[in-house]
Each structure stands twice: as C-alpha cells, then as structure tokens.
Amino acid sequence: KSPIFGPEEVNSVEGNSVSITCYYPPTSVNRHTRKYWCRQGARGGCITLISSEGYVSSKYAGRANLTNFPENGTFVVNIAQLSQDDSGRYKCGLGINSRGLSFDVSLEVSQGPGLLNDTKVYTVDLGRTVTINCPFKTENAQKRKSLYKQIGLYPVLVIDSSGYVNPNYTGRIRLDIQGTGQLLFSVVINQLRLSDAGQYLCQAGDDSNSNKKNADLQVLKPEPELVYEDLRGSVTFHCALGPEVANVAKFLCRQSSGENCDVVVNTLGKRAPAFEGRILLNPQDKDGSFSVVITGLRKEDAGRYLCGAHSDGQLQEGSPIQAWQLFVNEESTIPRSPTVVKGVAGSSVAVLCPYNRKESKSIKYWCLWEGAQNGRCPLLVDSEGWVKAQYEGRLSLLEEPGNGTFTVILNQLTSRDAGFYWCLTNGDTLWRTTVEIKIIEGEPNLKVPGNVTAVLGETLKVPCHFPCKFSSYEKYWCKWNNTGCQALPSQDEGPSKAFVNCDENSRLVSLTLNLVTRADEGWYWCGVKQGHFYGETAAVYVAVEERKAAGSRDVSLAKADAAPDEKVLDSGFREIENKAIQDPRLFAEEKAVADTRDQADGSRASVDSGSSEEQGGSSRHHHHHH
C-alpha cells in the first residue's frame, strides 16, 4: 500500500478553486524528492500537469501551483478557475509518475453560475498576472506567434514563439501554445507594472493571411481601503493576492516617508519590535490569501499599510499588493486595561477581559500568543467549557463580572507562563485585547500546603493562610472540577501565625472534608474576591488513600504527604489506585500567588500560562476532555 495519502474525492463548482493536500512520510529522501500532480489517462498513463521542479502544463498556466511543506510532510496543489473539463482522475505522488508512491484523487467539477467569456479588455491589479488569449485559424497553426505593444504610433515586439522576449518583460512573461486541438495561444505576464498598461496586438503568422487580435490592458493601482478602528481594539487586514503567489513570501508593511514601506511582519520571520505580542500573520488558504491581525491598537499605528508578495519579503516593483489606510479612533468604546500584568512565581493572576457588551452570549476565548514562525495564538480555555489539558486545575474562565467583562484566573504560575495573551470572542473581532504577563520574584500572599493526602472515611482539614492585606476581602474555598470551581463551606479559625509583621487582621481559613470519599480527590482553590472581582488564588491537590489507622487529619503548612504506595513515573505522573494524576509535588516549590496590587485591586487585562507540567481548569462552565 502506498504511504502517500490525500483526499479520495474532491467536489467543487466551475470558477472555484481547490487546494489539495497530499501527505507523505517526512523522511529526508521524501522531503527533497520530486512532487507531482498528474491526470490519469484512459490507457493507464498519467500525464504530469504540475511538479515541484517547476514544470507547469499549459492547461494549468496561470491558474495552478504546487507547494511543498517538507517540515509537515505535505505538499499542496492549488488549482483555480476550475472548469468541468478539469473533472477526472488524478494522482498526487513522489518521485516518478510510473512508480507506486502516489495517491488517487477524483476531482468532480459541476456546473457553476457560468463564467464570463474572454474579452479584449483586461483589467488587472498591479503586481498580479494577466493571460492574454489569442485565437488563430488552422492555416496559421505552424506559423510564428507574437505579441506587440503599441508605443505611440509603432508596435513594439514584446514576445514571440521563436524565443524573443523584450527586456522590459524578462523573467515575467511566457508564450504558451495550446495543444493541437485548440487554435489558441496565450501570453502570460506576471508581476504587472503600471507601465505594462496599454494597447497590445497578438498575431499568428506574418503575411496578409495572419490572424490578429487587439487587447487593451488596464493595470490598476489599488486604492487604499479606508479602515476605522478603535484605540486598544483590533484590526484584521485580509490580503488576497491570488494563487500565482501562493508560494511566494508574503508581507505587510507600513508606508513611511516617500515610497518607503517598513516591514511590519512577513512570512520570512521578520516582525517589527513595536508589534511583538500583538500581531499574527495567518495563511488562511493555500490560494495565496492571508490575513494579518493586529491587537491593542495604538495611536501611532495609524497610517497606510500595504500587503504584498515578493521573494525577499518586502515591497518591490511588480509585487502584487493591496492597500489600506488605517485610522485609529481615540474616542474608543474599548475600556482601558493594563498592557502588563505581573504575577509572582508560584502565585496567580486574575485578569479582566473586555468584550462587546451587546454580545453577552458570545463564546469567550483566551489564547497564548506564540511568536515562532508567523505568530499564532493557540486557545487555552473558552467559555463553553473547553480547557487545554495541561491547564486543568489551574486555569479558569469566568463569565463574571459580566456586562462587558469576563475574568480569567491562572494559578501555580511559573516562569514559563510569562508571555503575551489575548482575550477574544467569536463575536466582534474588533474586541481583541492583549496583555503581557510578567513573572516577578516574591512570595505568594496566600499560604497553603504543597499537597495533601486524605484517608477514606476520615475527616481532612486543609488550611489557607491569608495575610492582613486581605482583611477586607471575601475569602473562599472551592473545588475545581470540569464544571467550574464549586464553592465549599470553610471555617475562619482566627488570626494566622504564618506571617511575620502581620497583626490580628491576618486569617487562617480552613476547608474541612468530612467522611472523605474517592469523589473528594482533586484540585481545591482558596482565594479572595470582592463581589464579582476575583483576586489571588492558591491551589492544593488532595489525593485520597485507603484507611491505614483511625482518626482525622489536620494538615499543616509543613506537611506535604505522598501516598505511601505510590509509584513515581518518569513522565512526572504518579499512579494512585491505577489512576494517573499529575503529581502536585512536581511544582510544590513553584506554587505561587500573584501580587494582589496587580490583581484583586484591579487587573484589567487577560492572563495566561504555558507550563506543560501543570494542570489547568475552568470555573463555572462545562469542560470536555478530548
């Protein structure tokens, strides 16, 4: 069986594009060998239409490309301007066509709304590609084919079938003569310049019986689209440059003085420092289109932006481009929020994320910005109950306080949680905010034991020590689970002795679990809040073991009990009762609570974490494991 894999069947309509991904084992040999797309004939052969070595059949001229992604073990064939003639059986493969390293693909193109007939007037955007079609009669099939451009009173030869190319068009023009069945030749001009506009004449033959056709080429400089966005909000530039530049480097630049255009971001890895943490370049499709999202808009972001494609990742003559004029509205509907939130290692952060209050039912998301490649923001949590597995027990997205704000709580912070995080919804895309989480040195304010082992059927008491700075706050214990952090009854045991230089206003608040059952195992949070505004939290993992001796357990800060018969696995998990749970002792030293001056006293931004060794959770919502 061939190791190549792809879609068995692709269905589309006339005029549409398809993007066919073929997968191969990414061995060193496979990554570098020839990739091809061929059409199967009735007699069993397979005629190459396009390959990774640069060959493109005349049938695909100007409308198809093949891009190899060796790091993924994939290559993508894009075919645009589909017609019913494209319906048939194809193969995508590696090496030579006759070998078995291929996959069969059936392409079915049904009748669409109808395509426009070819016209003598070609209106094309700057930097794009034009195909000028030139019909001829049978008697001129073997004769010279040529294209002239009318300069003043005189026609100047641009290209002909004997191999001549006018120097002004070198490297960006070709003449294709269709198969013998079609009495048509085509001239394809890429990377159109403004100077290419004008009257053209194509000709087959040189005598009085020659066939001639006039063409009027209009090259349009894109008018900038006016974009008005709010200060602190978000803008998305959608850039559709056409399939012919699908495998050419893309860029977004901002015009400065004169014709200079400073690169904001490109697919070659360049990113302007001013946009760190607040920009993503998303290849939306393999047809050459992409989008750039910029969040946390600033006054100085206003200006003219161009997106384009060029091999060196910046604006050059002949780059296909789109343009926008961005205006940043300073009378913003988006509330101010800190652009930086600080958290102490081992502690927590509680971040307020703004959203459009008209969209209270929208799904809220929180993601971690990653700068690698072109930037991405993988989701960590959403308001429908999904939490990334590594964050169970330490991450929660709450709809509170509501009315245009939701809260994200992240605890057990480590240095790996430092970075940029985005708050967003599936509604108004303009309401995307960015916050940078910085991890600072210091001691957690809340003090809890590192981890706790409870005994079945007995009573367990878990302490949480609150310093005096939280005297006016509501103190709570809750059990984190897949549906949220359910509030539990707790007891105020009076002043805490865990703090030096702290008066009677410090508090020891205990959680008591009576008649412990298996269901009591899990993560417990203690924390502070003021109304619907959350402050610091601290997390404790409670493991449950069989009864060894009678009595109740009262856990002090000094204790960090491990189940006596546990087996510590290399992966950093431990087995208790044949159930693998993450070992809280792995990060007992890292347990932390964020500095509440940045938290309960008014963090107004989103937060996040990236520790792969810790669990994460969600509050007051449903959660699914995948």
Epitope: E9, V10, N16, S17, Y23, K361, R376, W386
Partner: nanobody
Framework: EVQLVESGGGLVQTGGSLRLSCAAS????????MGWFRQAPGKEREFVAA??????????YVGDSVQGRFTISRDAAGNTVYLQMNSVKPEDTAVYYC?????????????????????WGKGTLVTVSS
C-alpha cells in the same frame, strides 16, 4: 456545550451494510470538518474517513483499510455526517467515534491524526458477525 452524538451502530452480518450518523450540536457550533475513527479492543484508535468543506468545495478522505467499501457524506447544513459501511468484515468490529473540528487550522492538519481533532463523541459499537 458542544456535543457529538453517534447513532446507527449495532450487529450486522459479514458482507452486510450499515449507516452511521453523527449529529453535532451546541450553541454557535459550526464545524468545518467531521470524521470517523474506530477502536477495536486492545488496539489504537484508527482513522476511518473524514470530510472537510470550504465554501462550495468538499474534500473526502478514506482510510486504507476501508477504501472502496465505506463512504462519508454530510447533510446540507454541515452539522450531520454519515458513514455508509458496505461489504463489512469481522475486522470492522469496533467502537466507532465521531470527531469534529470547530475552526479551520492555519496549517493543513492530517485528518488521520486523532490529536488534530477538537471534539469527540462517546462512540457507537458496531459488531460484525461471521
């Protein structure tokens, strides 16, 4: 809350046919790809078939072991996917799981990889008797 509910499983004789359905529901949930995996006792989860759509274009993928026998399709709304199982064999006995992807990925994912799917159903048992 997003839910994928499989139905149509049951007992079928070798050489027979069965049609599985998977309905996706949930507030504002609109998948862009749905697929089927199966898991026989003691074996890894195996890719069966998937369907992905973009505008008027549909891409169908089928696993090696079921090629030519199983076909995948979807309803016009795109929230229900079907697996038509023909010429079934005893080795097709397994729990069949429906999978769905909520958002298009920035880079093309391999539909055969269970890790690349966001949502899963609880599964429906298909038993092929000889």
């Amino acid at each position: 809350e997003v839910q994928l509910v499989e139905s149509g499983g049951g007992l079928v004789q070798t050489g027979g046919s069965l049609r599985l359905s998977c309905a996706a529901s949930g507030r504002t949930f609109s998948p862009y790809a749905m697929g089927w995996f199966r898991q026989a006792p003691g074996k890894e989860r195996e890719f069966v078939a998937a369907i992905r759509w973009s505008g008027a274009t549909t891409y169908k993928y089928v696993g090696d072991s079921v090629q030519g026998r199983f076909t995948i399709s979807r309803d016009a709304a795109g929230n229900t996917v079907y697996l038509q199982m023909n010429s079934v064999k005893p080795e097709d006995t397994a729990v069949y799981y429906c999978a769905a992807d909520r958002v298009p990925k920035d880079i093309s994912i391999d539909p055969r990889n269970p890790k690349d799917w966001d949502y899963w159903g609880k599964g429906t048992l298909v038993t092929v008797s000889s």
